[in-house]
């Protein structure tokens, strides 16, 4: 029995619903009484949802899963996962047994966009060319962990003296803090870009130092 799932991961935003597609080709005369369907976590073998003896056996996974009962007879064994959490991320296996048996695994990729970075400067007054300043770029509640890039006003990457740290909250989302230590020129703009690698979403923040006062666009 051939079981088909998408090759690419299913990407779902935290808090939204996701459909993990799985399909099989029922033979003529197929009835749901013949169908055994099991969804489980690929790595831990934990049961997620099942269908047997013509009945939906329900969710074994935090009561957030559902099948598409009206579509099962047509070979649609897809699973609906509600209110996606970071902890849901991973591989799910769809097992289908009629007379024959088949299985396939589909990957769920969870994502959450990062907030627009906030920029802070230390020290933040009486700055002169040649002073060393610490610029902190902070962006919040994203997933997965971000890449952070710094550049100057001319678009030249700044890679030295950068320290980036991630902080996980209780929901598994990340706050990212990146610190750039730089010696000031006569004036300049310093930008940080926080990139979510799954969403290919870039969040930008910048600070312009023009003697006095400073501006935070």
């Amino acid at each position: 029995l051939e079981v088909q799932v998408p090759e690419d991961p299913v990407v779902a935003l935290v808090g939204t619903d996701a459909t993990l597609c799985c399909s099989f080709s029922p033979e003529p005369g197929f009835s749901l009484a013949q169908l055994n369907l099991i969804w489980q976590l690929t790595d831990t073998k934990q049961l997620v949802h099942s269908f047997a003896e013509g009945q939906d056996q329900g969710s074994a996974y935090a009561n957030r899963t559902a099948l598409f009962p009206d579509l099962l007879a047509q070979g649609n064994a897809s699973l609906r996962l509600q209110r996606v959490r970071v902890a849901d991320e991973g591989s799910f296996t769809c097992f289908v047994s009629i007379r024959d048996f088949g299985s396939a695994a589909v990957s769920l990729q969870v994502a959450a966009p990062y907030s627009k970075p906030s920029m802070t400067l230390e020290p933040n007054k009486d700055l002169r060319p040649g002073d060393t300043v610490t610029i902190t770029c902070s962006s919040y509640r994203g997933y997965p962990e971000a890449e952070v890039f710094w550049q100057d006003g001319q678009g030249v990457p700044l890679t030295g003296n950068v320290t980036t740290s991630q902080m996980a909250n209780e929901q598994g989302l990340f706050d990212v803090h990146s610190v750039l230590r730089v010696v000031l020129g006569a004036n300049g703009t310093y930008s940080c870009l926080v990139r979510n690698p799954v969403l290919q979403q870039d969040a930008h923040g910048s600070v312009t130092i023009t003697g006095q006062p400073m501006t935070f666009p």
Epitope: E89, S91, P144, E147, M167, A168, P197
Partner: antibody, heavy 121, light 108 residues
């Protein structure tokens, strides 16, 4: 069953290089962040480096190895690597490959048996 | 960097007795703390994650508690195979991922 098997350790002189490998099986390798943790003789555990999952190749290093060590992974071969350059005597340790429990929670739920790296003149 | 301090450095206990190990963080790690056991000549093994959740296959004589900065690993009745070194590790704020210095549990 999850298995992590390190290889590539040995005796080298200060300044030389070594490449460690970790062959993974029993789980969907590409779905998990992976780490190297080391333990100097008679000492405690020290996290060395982490690479995140899929092919995003976002990497992190302990300050003690930054600029000298490079972590990488080949998801098609289910293998994690640690390229160690400019080795120092203080890098002498057993190096463990460790799987992150999840991608947001970086505890280490499975460890290899370790491979010994000795840096000595 | 979050520093983890474990105490005591060595704990002498008789088999069958209770052992209580402490781990203190230099700043709050919420519940992002794990405990590991390392027997001589072996790799570490995960016991507890998220401060109080037992890892797969870990006997229920091992329990973890605490949140914020103060954490405890309790072994209710020490078995011969429990004599080992125990490490705590935080994963709230990284890099670096940091470990405590370890507590050796030895036979009294």
């Amino acid at each position: 069953d999850v298995q992590l098997v390190e290889s590539g350790g040995g005796v080298v002189r200060p300044g030389e290089s070594l490449r460690l490998s970790c062959a993974a099986s029993g789980f969907t390798f590409s779905n998990y962040a992976m780490n190297w943790v080391r333990q100097a003789p008679g000492e405690g555990l020290e996290w060395v480096s982490r690479i995140n999952y899929k092919g995003y190749n976002i990497t992190y290093y302990a300050d003690s190895v930054k600029g000298r060590f490079t972590i990488s992974r080949d998801n098609s071969k289910n293998t994690l690597y640690l390229q160690m350059n400019s080795l120092r005597a203080e890098d002498t340790a057993v190096y463990y490959c460790a799987k992150s429990g999840s991608n947001s929670n970086n505890f280490f739920d499975y460890w290899g048996l370790g491979t010994l790296v000795t840096v000595s003149s | 960097e979050i520093v983890l301090t474990q105490s005591p450095g060595t704990l002498s206990v008789s088999p069958g007795e209770r052992a209580t190990l402490s781990c203190r963080a230099s700043q709050s790690v919420n519940s992002k703390l794990a405990w590991y056991q390392q027997r001589p000549g072996q790799a570490p093994r995960l016991l507890i994650y998220d401060a109080s959740s037992r890892a797969t296959g870990i006997p229920d004589r091992f329990s973890g508690s605490g949140s914020g900065t103060d954490f405890t690993l309790t072994i209710s009745r020490l078995e011969p195979e429990d004599f080992a070194v125990y490490y705590c590790q935080q994963y709230k704020n990284w890099p670096p991922l940091t470990f405590g210095g370890g507590t050796k549990v030895e036979i009294k």
